[in-house]
C-alpha cells in the first residue's frame, strides 16, 4: 500500500480468482483513543472499533472511503483505491490502446518545435468518475524539471456504438535549449483513477522524435505566363523554431486531382517555392518536415488550382 | 527521404555539401545496423545514449546560432581551446567563435573516426562476419575533415590485445551510430546556418 495523495491510498493486488488479497491496517487520524468506530462509504454498518482497523482487501467491494467516527462526529477519512496486477502486468482498463506507432501505445505526444513544449493526449470510453494527474521530467534517475498543466477533455467522437473521449495535456521543459542534443529522454507519467480503480501510464521519448511541424503558411499560387505551370510559394509556420537557417525544413508539394484514384504528382524541395503543373479541378498541397532529422511530416496545407 | 539532393554551387560554403553527405551516410549505416542487428538492443529506446565527445569538445555551445545566445539554457559553455585555421573559412571573414565552432566539429569527426576504425578492426575478426562499417561513411568523414582542414595532432588508433567481445562491440556500434547521427544533424544545421550567414 502507498499514499497517492493525502488520505488517498493505493492497494496493489495480484488479481486472480480466489486470490488472498492484501491485509491493510488503517489508523484513525485523531488523538482520541476509544469510542472510535469505522464505516465504509455511505453505509452505516460498523466494520470495527478502535483506533486501527485491519481489513483484508481482495476486490473492489473492499475498496472505497473508510471513515472513523466518534459519537456521530467524523474524525478522518482514508480512501482506498485498487491497482490490479494481472499475471505480472499492471492493468490498462481505463485508457484505449491507440496502436500507433506501435501496439500498447496509450499516451501519444507531439511537439511543434524544439522549444521544449509538447502536448500529450490519450483516449478512453469512460465518461464519468474519471480523474487524471500528469507529471513529467527529463530523465528518471536525476530528473530535471518539466511543468505540465491540468489534463483537459479536448475532444469527443462517436466510434460505432461507443463514444470516445480524448484528453490532452501541455507540458514545458523548464530550461530547454532548442539546439541541445538530447541524451536523456522526457518521461511522462499519467495517473488515472476511475471510481475505485487506479492505473498509471508512462511514455518516454526525445523531443526530436515527436516533432511534427505545423503546416506551411501563406500557401499561394502564381500562374506563369503562357504556361500551364504555376509557381507555388509558402512560408515556414510561425510555430517553427528559429533561426530557420539552423532549424531548416524540407517540403513535399503534391498535385492531387479531384478523384482520389488520380495519380498524385509529388515534388520534394528545401526551398519555399516550387513550379508545378496545375490541372483543372486539382488542388496543390504542401507539407513540411525537419530537413535533417526525419520525424513526422506536418499536416497538408492546401489550395485549389482554379 | 531517398531523393536526390542537388549538388551545391561552387561558390557555396564549401563544407555544406560534405556535411549533407555525412548525415546521409550515417543515417544509412544506422538503418543497416538496426536491420542487421535486429536481435540486439539497437533501437533508440533500448540503447544508452552516450556522447564520446562529452567534456572533450563543445560543438553545440561553440556553434550556437547568434539568435540563441540570449537563451540562458543554451549557455552551458565549457572552456575548451581549439586551433583556429581552416579552409572552410578561407573565402570569408570569420569571427573567433566561428573558428572555434568549426574546429570543434573537426575534433568530433576525428574522435568518431578513431572509434569507428578501431571498431571495424574488431568487427572484421568476428567469425559471424555479421556487420562492418560502411566504407562510404568512413570516406565521407575523411572528406569533411579534409574540407575543414585543421592541423591537429593525429590520434593513434586504439589497439586492444584482449580477445574482443563481439556482442559488446555490436552494442557499442549501435550506441556510437546513434550518437554520431545526432552530432551529424547538429553539424548539418550549423553548416546550413553558416552558409546562410
Amino acid at each position: 500500500i502507498w499514499e497517492l495523495k493525502k488520505d488517498v491510498y493505493v492497494v496493489e493486488l495480484d488479481w486472480y480468482p480466489d486470490a488472498p488479497g492484501e491485509m491493510v491496517v488503517l489508523t484513525c487520524d485523531t488523538p482520541e483513543e476509544d469510542g472510535i468506530t469505522w464505516t465504509l462509504d455511505q453505509s452505516s454498518e460498523v466494520l470495527g472499533s478502535g483506533k486501527t482497523l485491519t481489513i483484508q482487501v481482495k476486490e473492489f467491494g473492499d475498496a472505497g472511503q473508510y471513515t472513523c467516527h466518534k459519537g456521530g462526529e467524523v474524525l478522518s477519512h482514508s480512501l482506498l483505491l485498487l491497482h490490479k496486477k494481472e499475471d505480472g502486468i499492471w492493468s490498462t482498463d481505463i485508457l484505449k490502446d491507440q496502436k500507433e506507432p506501435k501496439n500498447k501505445t496509450f499516451l501519444r505526444c507531439e511537439a511543434k518545435n524544439y522549444s521544449g513544449r509538447f502536448t500529450c493526449w490519450w483516449l478512453t470510453t469512460i465518461s464519468t468518475d474519471l480523474t487524471f494527474s500528469v507529471k513529467s521530467s527529463r530523465g528518471s534517475s536525476d530528473p530535471q524539471g518539466v511543468t505540465c498543466g491540468a489534463a483537459t477533455l479536448s475532444a469527443e467522437r462517436v466510434r460505432g456504438d461507443n463514444k470516445e473521449y480524448e484528453y490532452s495535456v501541455e507540458c514545458q521543459e523548464d530550461s530547454a535549449c532548442p539546439a541541445a542534443e538530447e541524451s536523456l529522454p522526457i518521461e511522462v507519467m499519467v495517473d488515472a483513477v476511475h471510481k475505485l480503480k487506479y492505473e498509471n501510464y508512462t511514455s518516454s521519448f526525445f523531443i526530436r522524435d515527436i516533432i511534427k511541424p505545423d503546416p506551411p503558411k501563406n500557401l499561394q499560387l502564381k500562374p506563369l505566363k503562357n504556361s500551364r505551370q504555376v509557381e507555388v510559394s509558402w512560408e515556414y509556420p510561425d510555430t517553427w523554431s528559429t533561426p530557420h537557417s539552423y532549424f531548416s525544413l524540407t517540403f513535399c508539394v503534391q498535385v492531387q486531382g479531384k478523384s482520389k484514384r488520380e495519380k498524385k504528382d509529388r515534388v520534394f524541395t528545401d526551398k519555399t517555392s516550387a513550379t508545378v503543373i496545375c490541372r483543372k479541378n486539382a488542388s496543390i498541397s504542401v507539407r513540411a518536415q525537419d530537413r535533417y532529422y526525419s520525424s513526422s511530416w506536418s499536416e497538408w496545407a492546401s489550395v485549389p488550382c482554379s | 527521404r531517398n531523393l536526390p539532393v542537388a549538388t551545391p554551387d561552387p561558390g557555396m560554403f564549401p563544407c555544406l555539401h560534405h556535411s549533407q553527405n555525412l548525415l546521409r551516410a550515417v543515417s544509412n549505416m544506422l538503418q543497416k545496423a538496426r536491420q542487421t542487428l535486429e536481435f540486439y538492443p539497437c533501437t533508440s529506446e533500448e540503447i544508452d545514449h552516450e556522447d564520446i565527445t562529452k567534456d572533450k569538445t563543445s560543438t553545440v555551445e561553440a556553434c550556437l546560432p547568434l539568435e540563441l545566445t540570449k537563451n540562458e539554457s543554451c549557455l552551458n559553455s565549457r572552456e575548451t581551446s581549439f586551433i583556429t585555421n581552416g579552409s572552410c573559412l578561407a573565402s570569408r571573414k570569420t569571427s573567433f567563435m566561428m573558428a572555434l565552432c568549426l574546429s570543434s566539429i573537426y575534433e568530433d569527426l576525428k574522435m568518431y573516426q578513431v572509434e569507428f576504425k578501431t571498431m571495424n578492426a574488431k568487427l572484421l575478426m568476428d567469425p559471424k562476419r555479421q556487420i562492418f562499417l560502411d566504407q562510404n561513411m568512413l570516406a565521407v568523414i575523411d572528406e569533411l575533415m579534409q574540407a575543414l582542414n585543421f592541423n591537429s595532432e593525429t590520434v593513434p588508433q586504439k589497439s586492444s590485445l584482449e580477445e574482443p567481445d563481439f556482442y559488446k562491440t555490436k552494442i557499442k556500434l549501435c550506441i556510437l551510430l546513434h550518437a554520431f547521427r545526432i552530432r551529424a544533424v547538429t553539424i548539418d544545421r550549423v553548416m546550413s546556418y553558416l552558409n546562410a550567414s
Epitope: 480466489d18 486470490a19 499475471d87 505480472g88 502486468i89 482498463d93 500498447k104 | 536481435f39
Partner: antibody
C-alpha cells in the same frame, strides 16, 4: 472453489460452425479476463482468444481472427466461443482459462472437424 | 508457430536432476514473467511455476524455476515416476499482450 466447465464440442464438417460455452462458478466471474486455449491431438498448447472482464475488448490469434468470436455473459457467468468456417486444422481440445498469475483451467471439450 | 523454444524431450533416471530450457527474445521473456505448466496425458495443464520462480501451494519444492535475460528454465530435482509428462513454458510479448505465448513443449521421460 473455482470451477470451469466447457461444453459444445463435437464432430462437424469443414466449413461448418460450432459454439462452445464455458460455465464458471466459485468466483466473481465479471471481475476477470478469460482465455480460450486449444491443443491439437499430439501437439502443443495454442492460445486462441482473450476477452476482458467487462467484454469491452477481445483479442484473437491470427489463425482464428475473422472466423472465431469470443464473448461473455457476466449475468450468466458464462464464456463463449463462436467458431465459423471450421477447417481440419481447428480439430483440438478447447480449454477455457482464467487470466492471472494463478490460473484455473476447465477440463476441455473436443472439437473434431472432418469430412 | 511458437516463438518460445524448448527441447522436444529430456530424460533422467529416478532421483536425478533434469532441466528444461525455454528460449525467447527481448520482447517476450526479456520483458515479461514466465510460467511453467505440467500436463499429464489426457488432462488439462497444471500450473507449476508463476512469476519466473514462484511455486503455487501444493507444488513440491522439487520443482524450481529461474529466468535470466531472454531465457528461462525449469529444474526438477529428485526425479520421480509421476513427473513423466509434457512441460510447457508460457510468457507474453510486450506488443501482443494479452495473447499467451506458449513454448513448444518438452516431454520428460523417467528412465
Amino acid at each position: 472453489q473455482v470451477q470451469l466447465v466447457e461444453s459444445g464440442g463435437g464432430v462437424v464438417q469443414p466449413g461448418a460452425s460450432l459454439a462452445l460455452s464455458c460455465a464458471a462458478s466459485g468466483f466473481t466471474f465479471s471481475s476477470y479476463g478469460m482465455h480460450w486455449v486449444r491443443q491439437a491431438p499430439g501437439k502443443g498448447l495454442e492460445w486462441v482468444a482473450f476477452i476482458r472482464y467487462d467484454g469491452s475488448n477481445a483479442y484473437y490469434a491470427d489463425s482464428v481472427a475473422g472466423r472465431f468470436t469470443i464473448s461473455r455473459d457476466n449475468s450468466k457467468n458464462t464464456l463463449y466461443l463462436q467458431m465459423n468456417s471450421l477447417a481440419a486444422e481447428d480439430t483440438a481440445v478447447y480449454y477455457c482459462k482464467t487470466h492471472g498469475s494463478h490460473d484455473n483451467w476447465g477440463q476441455g471439450t473436443m472439437v473434431t472437424v472432418s469430412s | 508457430q511458437s516463438v518460445l523454444t524448448q527441447p522436444p524431450s529430456v530424460s533422467g533416471a529416478p532421483g536425478q536432476r533434469v532441466t528444461i530450457s525455454c528460449s525467447g527474445s527481448r520482447s517476450n521473456i526479456g520483458s515479461n514473467t514466465v510460467k511453467w505448466y505440467q500436463q499429464l496425458p489426457g488432462t488439462a495443464p497444471k500450473l507449476l511455476i508463476y512469476y519466473n520462480d514462484q511455486r503455487p501451494s501444493g507444488v513440491p519444492d522439487r520443482f524450481s524455476g529461474s529466468k535470466s535475460g531472454t531465457s528461462a528454465s525449469l529444474a526438477i530435482t529428485g526425479l520421480q515416476a509421476e513427473d513423466e509428462a509434457d512441460y510447457y513454458c508460457q510468457s507474453y510479448d510486450r506488443y501482443t499482450h494479452p495473447a499467451l505465448l506458449f513454448g513448444t513443449g518438452t516431454k520428460v521421460t523417467v528412465l
